[in-house]
């Protein structure tokens, strides 16, 4: 059934080429190569992909042909290692090529860079883009795959094919429209924002698998799928979890052809077994493959079955708890998580996992006690504070968001997080705090029953961005501790951090607060980022500054930018008024 139906194949590359078709094969190989060699020029990657594709075709024609029996890692790794400038461009990554599989692939994976030193993608004029699209549609779309893949080395490859399909559709439609820009730009903005979100969500899945292991990922998947498919039986959910784990393990491991193939099989299985999974899948299952897989991944939670019995009966009141636990610990805990999650679509996945962990810890202790039943009888009472903590936090933060609006809410978080972990780089603090702040507009509009799963699971994704960026250049023991101790307790760990009293304030540098006329031509978003960067630097200089002091300085700063951007001689205004602002700010903050 499902994802594991295939027999062994003489040639893996031929098998995948036939399963996926030439177009998807080429696209996935390009993504794989761009995610490994993130600095290589587009033309070099296209050349490598064409060579691999030609080779795959020879294997399709004759599976016994030379080298066709080699593993995909061997074939792709050998191809990547032919790049002439590997040592100059990638330094020690070139040492990977001296290794044998599977160590070589592991080595390439370890060198993936979450924050590659690449120029920001600048969007050309609409007419320029449309001309490029019409001149060579294939190259235009390949370039999109390449640019996204190299900047997001863990992007979920089959989903990137779906984004590329939408990207193509946008250009096909809008380049013929009367007002090309009005048609195209909102679509591109939507794709960009959805793409960033998709990349971040997948990055958390890969971090979960790579840093915390398969068991952690499976627990997450049991909880999420049980919320989504509450009518499905436990065995069905367990089967879906196993197949989904295989798909994500493959994609996170760089096995993109196998991943895309298995994801298609999983979608097929789910649609063939809708009746025993969910009543919400009908529309998804009528769509073409890429849309179908995406739709299933985003499908709304099915209605909970009526009259589900109390959880306490099987998991607390029963005298058989320890016996059932001893019979198969992980299965029993899996059933607990399934039963709890399907009854609680109003809880975040991470909360459900905290409850399951608490339950497991209690059973480990109590099942070795003299009177196990008496020992675990009150286990559900231990859940109450765990449930209330995120509920209260979300309530407080949504109130703050509604009072301040997104920009000022982000600023409040910038100050809060800079005080917690001032050693973290300013760009990372700005990026992460801005994203944390978006939780307000994303989740606070929801009714109570949807707020927690929206907010806390989103925060897990954002804090993972902080964790992966920090891992590249670790500067704070507190960040390392919160990121590595427990996947499900990352958010509570960061929430519990107080001001870092050990931090030695940064030396004042006037250059940091010197602004020029170019700020006036920036978009509103870019201008906000400039101001927020200054705010972080202010807090790093004066961690003990009060909210009132910081607000006064930021208000002055906003007025200064507005005034100089209206001035005739902008540059002179920025130079003269800027000096005054710096002096006034230093005085206001006692610097």
């Amino acid at each position: 059934r499902g994802v594991f139906r295939r027999d062994a194949h003489k040639s893996e590359v031929a098998h995948r080429f036939k399963d996926l078709g030439e177009e998807n094969f080429k696209a996935l190989v390009l993504i794989a190569f761009a995610q490994y060699l993130q600095q290589c020029p587009f033309e070099d990657h296209v050349k490598l992909v064409n060579e691999v594709t030609e080779f795959a075709k020879t294997c399709v024609a004759d599976e016994s042909a030379e080298n066709c029996d080699k593993s995909l890692h061997t074939l792709f790794g050998d191809k990547l290692c032919t790049v002439a400038t590997l040592r100059e461009t990638y330094g020690e990554m070139a040492d990977c090529c001296a290794k044998q599989e599977p160590e070589r692939n592991e080595c390439f994976l370890q060198h993936k860079d979450d924050n590659p030193n690449l120029p920001r993608l600048v969007r050309p004029e609409v007419d320029v883009m449309c001309t490029a699209f019409h001149d060579n549609e294939e190259t235009f779309l390949k370039k999109y795959l390449y640019e996204i893949a190299r900047r997001h080395p863990y992007f979920y490859a089959p989903e990137l094919l779906f984004f590329a399909k939408r990207y193509k559709a946008a250009f096909t439609e809008c380049c013929q429209a009367a007002d090309k820009a009005a048609c195209l730009l909102p679509k591109l903005d939507e794709l960009r924002d959805e793409g960033k979100a998709s990349s971040a969500k997948q990055r958390l899945k890969c971090a979960s698998l790579q840093k915390f292991g398969e068991r952690a990922f499976k627990a997450w998947a049991v909880a999420r799928l049980s919320q989504r498919f509450p009518k499905a039986e436990f065995a069905e959910v367990s089967k879906l979890v196993t197949d989904l784990t295989k798909v994500h393990t493959e994609c996170c491991h760089g096995d993109l052809l196998e991943c895309a193939d298995d994801r298609a099989d999983l979608a097929k299985y789910i649609c063939e077994n809708q009746d025993s999974i969910s009543s919400k899948l009908k529309e998804c299952c009528e769509k073409p493959l890429l849309e179908k897989s995406h739709c299933i991944a985003e499908v709304e939670n099915d209605e909970m079955p009526a009259d589900l019995p109390s959880l306490a009966a099987d998991f607390v009141e029963s005298k058989d708890v320890c016996k059932n636990y001893a019979e198969a610990k992980d299965v029993f805990l899996g059933m607990f998580l399934y039963e709890y999650a399907r009854r609680h679509p109003d809880y975040s996945v991470v909360l459900l996992l905290r409850l399951a962990k608490t339950y497991e810890t209690t059973l480990e202790k109590c099942c070795a006690a003299a009177d196990p039943h008496e020992c675990y009888a009150k286990v559900f009472d231990e859940f109450k504070p765990l449930v209330e903590e995120p509920q209260n936090l979300i309530k407080q933060n949504c109130e703050l968001f509604e009072q301040l609006g997104e920009y000022k809410f982000q600023n409040a978080l910038l100050v809060r997080y800079t005080k917690k972990v001032p050693q973290v780089s300013t760009p990372t603090l700005v990026e992460v705090s801005r994203n944390l702040g978006k939780v307000g507009s994303k989740c606070c509009k929801h009714p109570e029953a949807k707020r927690m799963p929206c907010a806390e699971d989103y925060l897990s994704v954002v804090l993972n961005q902080l964790c992966v960026l920090h891992e590249k250049t670790p500067v704070s023991d507190r960040v390392t501790k919160c990121c590595t101790e427990s996947l499900v307790n990352r958010r509570p760990c960061f929430s519990a951090l107080e001001v870092d009293e050990t931090y030695v304030p940064k030396e004042f540098n006037a250059e940091t607060f010197t602004f020029h006329a170019d700020i006036c031509t920036l978009s509103e978003k870019e201008r906000q980022i400039k101001k927020q960067t200054a705010l972080v630097e202010l807090v790093k200089h004066k961690p003990k500054a009060t909210k009132e002091q910081l607000k006064a300085v930021m208000d002055d700063f906003a007025a200064f930018v507005e005034k100089c951007c209206k001035a005739d001689d902008k540059e002179t205004c920025f130079a003269e008024e800027g000096k005054k602002l710096v002096a006034a700010s230093q005085a206001a903050l006692g610097l």
Partner: antibody, heavy 119, light 111 residues
Framework: EVQLVQSGAEVKKPGESLKISCKGS????????IGWVRQVPGRGLEWLAI????????RYSPSFEGQVTISADKSISTAYLQWSSLKASDTAMYYC????????????WGQGTLVTVSS | QSALTQPASVSGSPGQSITISCSGI?????????VSWYQQYPGKAPKLIIY???KRPSGVSNRFSGSKSGNTASLTISGLQADDEAEYSC???????????FGGGTQLTVL
């Protein structure tokens, strides 16, 4: 130190009854399932039955349901396997095992009891 | 008739690697990695060498490793030694309220 000590070898005639034992020590006997495994000479291992000494709940492999009885006395940390009427085909080595975390994982084993049934 | 299928015998020379397969694992056992491997010398009790598909009990050599793909588990022994010659059996969880199942056993011969 965890130990499972089984009773000695038995030679019996067809139709006779028999009860062999497995005494556990060095751990909380009531908190782990105990399983009995059969090995006919020259053949593989077979799970016969399991018991949870905490409440004496039992499970039997379909092939052995009604052929053997598993029991336990938690007061003396001992599990038993018994036959009411032995057959020549019951000739085998019988092992008991402590099952840890899941009933397919025997982490400690008895030394084995050889049962020979012959007329 | 075993619910799990293993090859009756495998052989290898000292220093080589061998792999023994065990197919027919139930979906639930596969989902929760509930597969164990045992080594047994003639006249001796079985010894647990792998549990939960890939984990080794303390004291077991790291030359023994386990893996799983679909409904088939595998035991790999690398750097084969003469004293690896023994019978190897897999066992898997068979579902709630059920007794576990064994494979038929595989006799490993070191040439």
């Amino acid at each position: 130190e965890v130990q499972l000590v089984q009773s000695g070898a038995e030679v019996k005639k067809p139709g006779e009854s028999l009860k062999i034992s497995c005494k556990g020590s060095g751990y909380s006997f009531t908190n782990y399932w105990i399983g009995w495994v059969r090995q006919v000479p020259g053949r593989g291992l077979e799970w016969l039955a399991i018991i949870y000494p905490g409440d004496s709940d039992t499970r039997y492999s379909p092939s052995f349901e009604g052929q053997v009885t598993i029991s336990a006395d938690k007061s003396i940390s001992t599990a038993y396997l018994q036959w009411s009427s032995l057959k020549a085909s019951d000739t085998a080595m019988y092992y008991c095992a402590r099952l840890h975390g899941v009933v397919s994982r025997g982490d400690y084993w008895g030394q084995g009891t050889l049962v020979t049934v012959s007329s | 008739q075993s619910a799990l299928t293993q090859p009756a015998s495998v052989s290898g020379s000292p220093g080589q690697s061998i792999t023994i397969s065990c197919s027919g694992i139930s979906s639930l056992a596969g989902s929760y990695n509930l597969v164990s491997w045992y080594q047994q010398y003639p006249g001796k009790a079985p010894k647990l060498i792998i549990y939960e598909v890939t984990k080794r009990p303390s004291g077991v050599s790291n030359r023994f490793s386990g893996s799983k793909s679909g409904n088939t588990a595998s035991l790999t022994i690398s750097g084969l030694q003469a004293d690896d010659e023994a019978e190897y059996s897999c066992s898997s969880y068979a579902g709630r309220n059920a007794v576990a199942v064994f494979g038929g056993g595989t006799q490993l011969t070191v040439l």
